[in-house]
Interface confidence: low
């Protein structure tokens, strides 16, 4: 169907003439509001058919929709029709006249409905009001249809302003009719199955006794029909179920299974769909990964979580340094794997009050006959720093040697500092950092050892003071991400007797 001019909408001047032509390979005609207006039909020389609709001396009353349709059963698609809409802005006409039965609007459930007040000019602002209240309602307006929304049982009027006069429409009455709404639920025993396994889908309707079930499913395309079983589940409310069962699924059974339910008494209906995937083999795949190194803090609890997807249900094992882990009776270690959706799993390892000995390499493995995944990471247990020892010695060459030893994880940093004014030190005077100075007054040497069995670093820092000529307060401070620790010692010159 071809309309010229093509539209789909025209705004015509009042009193003008307008010609519409519809052409097709089969006989066609124009319809307006289910009426057949006067028109000229012709068969063209090239074998096509056309119908010409001439609108002369148009008025606001010509505003509306026009359809070009096939006028007999020869049309290639009987239901096919083309629509155009014509506006004829007419300042003398407010709202288009309505048949009295169209002023009563019956709504059978909470669905969108239309209050069909229409104007001739698409530029007019139109508002909807409850008849008793003058406040405009916020409802979308379509100049071709009217107000579209969900309306309560009330009386309504439409208003517009043409020039400087306010124009009201007829009164519309909305009535709700109570009918039992259809509530359909569709569920599958499994939405993912391996080929050869069975597919079972249930479609259940509550509170309606006379219903019709209609299924559509992938097998229908190849003409292989499956006979559903209807199941009456008596009780309050009553339930009727239709069960579609395919005992041996094939890959081609993947797709959408739709259950359409209709109630013959009131033309009500509802449909629900569910997707089923048939797979060749089972699978396991990680959905999230973890950093290679995971951190736990000494004596704090730590949960490590792995999220994966699998079908069928896999077995899950956790290993530490290649040894299988199991829930400990002392409650120091808890393993759990939860099925959070049909094919999604979360496996958790919880270490309660982490010990240094729990540092090491961990692996989670999820597996079944068809597939497996594993995820490994290193668990590092962070330990607060401790200064274990701060000692001094006096070799014969007159130097003062200070040795500071401490431990922690991760590796601690060492900072030496000194304070000369003992009375004001350390609260009122910030200490001076010490290190390898160019004047060679001090020399610093630090050695770091990683103790494998303790899974922590030991730092030994030696500070040589070449020349001490007055008492000094010297502090050794160790610091890592877990905190800091320090010790102080007072160093006196060789020659100076010092009493505390």
């Amino acid at each position: 169907l071809v309309i010229t001019p093509p539209g789909p909408e025209f705004v015509l001047n009042i009193s003008s003439t307008f010609v519409l032509t519809c052409s097709s390979s089969a006989p066609v005609m124009w319809e307006q509001m289910s009426q057949v207006p006067w028109q000229e039909a012709a068969m063209n020389q090239d074998g096509t058919f056309s119908s010409v609709l001439t609108l002369t001396n148009v008025t606001g009353g010509d505003t509306g929709e026009y359809f070009c349709v096939y006028n007999n059963s020869l049309g290639p698609e009987l239901s096919e029709r083309k629509r155009i809409y014509i506006f004829v802005p007419d300042p003398t006409m407010g709202f288009l006249p309505m048949d009295s039965e169209d002023l009563f609007i019956f709504v059978t459930d909470v669905t969108e409905t239309t209050i069909p007040c229409r104007v001739t000019d698409p530029q007019l602002e139109v508002t909807l009001h409850e008849k008793k209240v003058d406040i405009p309602l916020h409802v979308p307006y379509d100049h071709q249809r009217g107000f579209i929304g969900t309306f309560e049982d009330k009386t309504y009027i439409c208003k517009t302003t043409i020039g400087d006069r306010e124009v009201d429409s007829d009164t519309y009455y909305v009535y709700s009719l109570q009918v039992s709404s259809i509530n359909v639920s569709v569920n599958a025993v499994q939405t993912v199955v391996r080929q050869g396994e069975s597919i079972t889908i249930r479609c259940i309707v509550m509170g309606n006794d006379v219903v019709n079930f209609q299924w559509t499913y992938p097998r229908m395309k190849s003409g292989r029909l499956v006979e559903p079983v209807t199941d009456y589940l008596f009780g309050v409310p009553s339930r009727i179920g239709s069960i579609l069962h395919i005992p041996t699924a094939e890959l081609s059974d993947s797709g959408t299974y739709t259950c359409n339910v209709s109630v013959s008494v009131n033309d009500h209906g509802d449909e629900k769909a569910i997707n089923v995937t048939v797979i060749e083999n089972g699978y396991v795949r990680l959905l999230e990964t973890l950093e290679d190194v995971q951190i736990a803090e000494l004596h704090r609890s730590r949960t490590l979580q792995v999220v994966f997807e699998a079908y069928p249900t896999p077995s899950v094992l956790w290993f530490k340094d290649n040894r299988t882990l199991g829930d400990s009776s002392a409650g120091e270690l808890v393993l759990s794997t939860r099925n959070v959706s049909e094919t999604r799993y979360v496996s958790e390892l919880t270490l309660v009050r982490v010990k240094v000995s729990e540092a090491g390499y961990y692996t989670m493995r999820a597996f079944h006959a068809d597939d497996q995944v594993q995820l490994s990471f290193k668990l590092q247990v962070n330990v607060p720093v401790r200064v274990l020892e701060l000692s001094e010695s006096h070799p014969a060459n007159g130097e003062q040697i200070l040795r500071c030893r401490g431990r922690g994880m991760p590796q601690p940093n060492v900072t030496w500092s000194t304070c000369r004014d003992l009375k004001r030190c350390p609260r009122k005077l910030s200490p001076t950092p010490l290190g390898n100075s160019s004047k060679e007054e001090s020399q610093l040497e630090t050695n770091v050892t990683f103790w494998e069995e303790d899974q922590e670093y030991e730092v030994v820092s030696t500070l040589r003071l070449r020349h001490v000529d007055q008492p000094l307060s010297v502090r050794c401070m160790l610091q890592n991400s877990m905190g800091r620790d320090s010790q102080e010692v007072t160093v006196v010159p060789h020659s100076l007797p010092f009493k505390v």
Partner: nanobody
Framework: EVQLVESGGGLVQAGGSLRLSCAAS????????MGWFRQTPGKEREFVAA????????HYADSVKGRFTISRDHAENAVFLQMNSLKPEDTAVYYC???????????????WGQGTQVTVSS
Amino acid sequence: EVQLVESGGGLVQAGGSLRLSCAASGRSFSSSVMGWFRQTPGKEREFVAATRWTAASTHYADSVKGRFTISRDHAENAVFLQMNSLKPEDTAVYYCAAGNYLDTAQYRYNYWGQGTQVTVSS
């Protein structure tokens, strides 16, 4: 004050799809036609598609017919443009527009969005 806010633009390969959304907000919004236009640097804004509230009437530019679909959501006061089988020549800034005439002419539309960039690479 009516505001139109577009989203959903981006970079896509030729043959791919994108869905543009345009949300209309404002204390009162009574335009019954919403549409999409597009513009490439140095060229006029070009009509793409438009629809009335009910989507009973829709209109498409010949260059996008069969590939683009315009739809609306009353509840959300929104219009969508589903763009399939995208071509490099669809690359443009896409603007959402609102008015009361279902028309291809820009001047028929009272409200405009800021635009969203769509780039189709070959």
